[in-house]
């Protein structure tokens, strides 16, 4: 039994880091493998992660962490029974994938303005709370070409757009994702999408 693709890990910078790897053949990850991880710190304890299958030869493990600090460094040991298959390290702050925003809501009752709001996925005491920026994707269910991205570079988890920038009388969907420049993170997954019917009053023409 050998590791074909070494584990790569990403952290949500709060409580979970996810590591994925591939074995050289079909493997029952949960029964055959264990991933041990330990914060490099005096008296810190080693923890064991039981991996799940992720395709035939792929494994994924969700490492639980009480908290994350920028200088944290973890040792990782992948075991098959008594055999050490791979040894490495992981610095969560260098491999951050933020949590996806939640509670995306479209408010359509504000005088021909669409107000989109969502929730920051981090608590206020987390470093990323004040460092997230967002991308909002809006698309038409009827017209695949009607697809747009709005970059929200301010901290407020909201976006205002004129309803008239979208077509009237049809349904749209929106979703939002996050990233943090400070840690050069990857983008989060998209939030669940929300749907609304776009309608607004056409302005009367003056003659």
């Amino acid at each position: 039994m050998k590791v074909l693709q070494e584990p790569t890990c990403v952290s949500d910078y709060m409580s979970i880091s996810t590591c994925e790897w591939k074995m050289n053949g079909p493997t029952n990850c949960s029964t055959e493998l264990r991933l041990l991880y330990q914060l490099v710190f005096l008296l810190s304890e080693a923890h064991t992660c039981i991996p799940e299958n992720n395709g035939g030869a792929g494994c994924v493990c969700h490492l639980l962490m009480d908290d994350v600090v920028s200088a944290d460094n973890y040792t990782l040991d992948l075991w098959a029974g008594q055999q050490l298959l791979w040894k490495g390290s992981f610095k969560p702050s260098e491999h951050v994938k933020p949590r996806a925003p939640g509670n995306l809501t479209v408010h359509t009752n504000v005088s021909d303005t669409l107000l989109l709001t969502w929730s920051n996925p981090y608590p206020p005491d987390n470093y990323l709370y004040n460092h997230l920026t967002y991308a909002v994707n809006i698309w038409s269910e009827n017209d695949p070409a009607d697809f747009r991205i709005y970059n929200v570079t301010y901290l407020e988890p909201s976006l205002r757009i004129a309803a008239s920038t979208l077509k009237s009388g049809i349904s749209y969907r929106a979703r939002v994702r996050a990233w943090a420049q400070c840690y050069n993170t990857t983008w989060s997954e998209w939030s669940p999408s929300t749907k609304w019917h776009n309608s607004y009053r056409e302005p009367f023409e003056q003659h």
Epitope: V40, F41, L43, S44, E45, A71
Partner: antibody, heavy 120, light 110 residues
Framework: EVQLVQSGAEVKKPGASVKVSCKAS????????MNWVRQAPGQRLEWMGT????????GYNQKFKGRVTITVDKSASTAYMELSSLRSEDTAVYYC?????????????WGQGTTVTVSS | DIVLTQSPDSLAVSLGERATINCRAS??????????IHWYQQKPGQPPKLLIY???NLESGVPDRFSGSGSGTDFTLTISSLQAEDVATYYC????????FGGGTKVEIK
């Protein structure tokens, strides 16, 4: 209110041992590491060792080469530091201080200090 | 082992003026996953008091004239407006598998 109360001053002869106690109150004793730090007159702070009261795991400053032993009595919420083969340069104020892994070892409460004098 | 060198050894500052204390580590600390920096204040005859943890986090109850910054090998404790009660010796501390203290900086009033 969090309190760490240490035992009283000690005068010892070279070659003897000293055992200093640190009684904790006002928090859950097993939730925090307990550290021992000493300070010789006019000198910098010097870490001696740390114990995790939850499982009695210990880590020591190798400078003391087995002369220091840190223990806990969980039922009494008390930590102990014993230093053996005392020499005159061990004359110092000895402090206990608690720390939290979440804060990565920052010592937020300290005992009042115990003066140990080693003199023939 | 990491060695922490504080500068200056002593510092005389007028009341209301800024005091800046430096702490240099012999190896990169926070940017390399190599540990954590904290700052303490110690007054004569008293145990140390935690001021700043994890480089730049103010401990509860500590006045906000104290702040910490830095990365890599260089860290700084700043007192933005020195008060009489700030006269003390200040220590930086590095922690990972060992705990190390700097040599201390004595702050006095000019």
């Amino acid at each position: 209110e969090v309190q760490l109360v240490q035992s009283g001053a000690e005068v010892k002869k070279p070659g003897a041992s000293v055992k200093v106690s640190c009684k904790a109150s006002g928090y859950t004793f097993t939730d925090y590491y307990m550290n021992w730090v000493r300070q010789a007159p006019g000198q910098r702070l010097e870490w001696m060792g740390t114990i995790n009261p939850y499982n009695a795991g210990t880590g020591y400053n190798q400078k003391f080469k087995g002369r220091v032993t840190i223990t806990v009595d969980k039922s009494a919420s008390t930590a102990y530091m014993e230093l053996s083969s005392l020499r005159s340069e061990d004359t110092a104020v000895y402090y206990c201080a608690r720390s939290l892994l979440r804060r990565r070892g920052a010592m937020d409460y300290w005992g009042q200090g115990t003066t140990v004098t080693v003199s023939s | 082992d990491i060695v922490l060198t504080q500068s200056p050894d002593s510092l005389a500052v007028s009341l209301g003026e800024r005091a800046t204390i430096n702490c240099r580590a012999s190896k990169s600390v926070s940017t390399s996953g190599y540990g954590y920096i904290h700052w303490y204040q110690q007054k004569p005859g008293q145990p140390p008091k935690l001021l700043i943890y994890l480089v730049d986090n103010l401990e509860s109850g500590v006045p906000d004239r104290f702040s910490g910054s830095g990365s890599g090998t260089d860290f700084t404790l700043t007192i933005s407006s020195l008060q009489a009660e700030d006269v003390a010796t200040y220590y930086c501390q590095h922690i990972r598998e060992l705990y190390t203290f700097g040599g201390g900086t004595k702050v006095e009033i000019k």
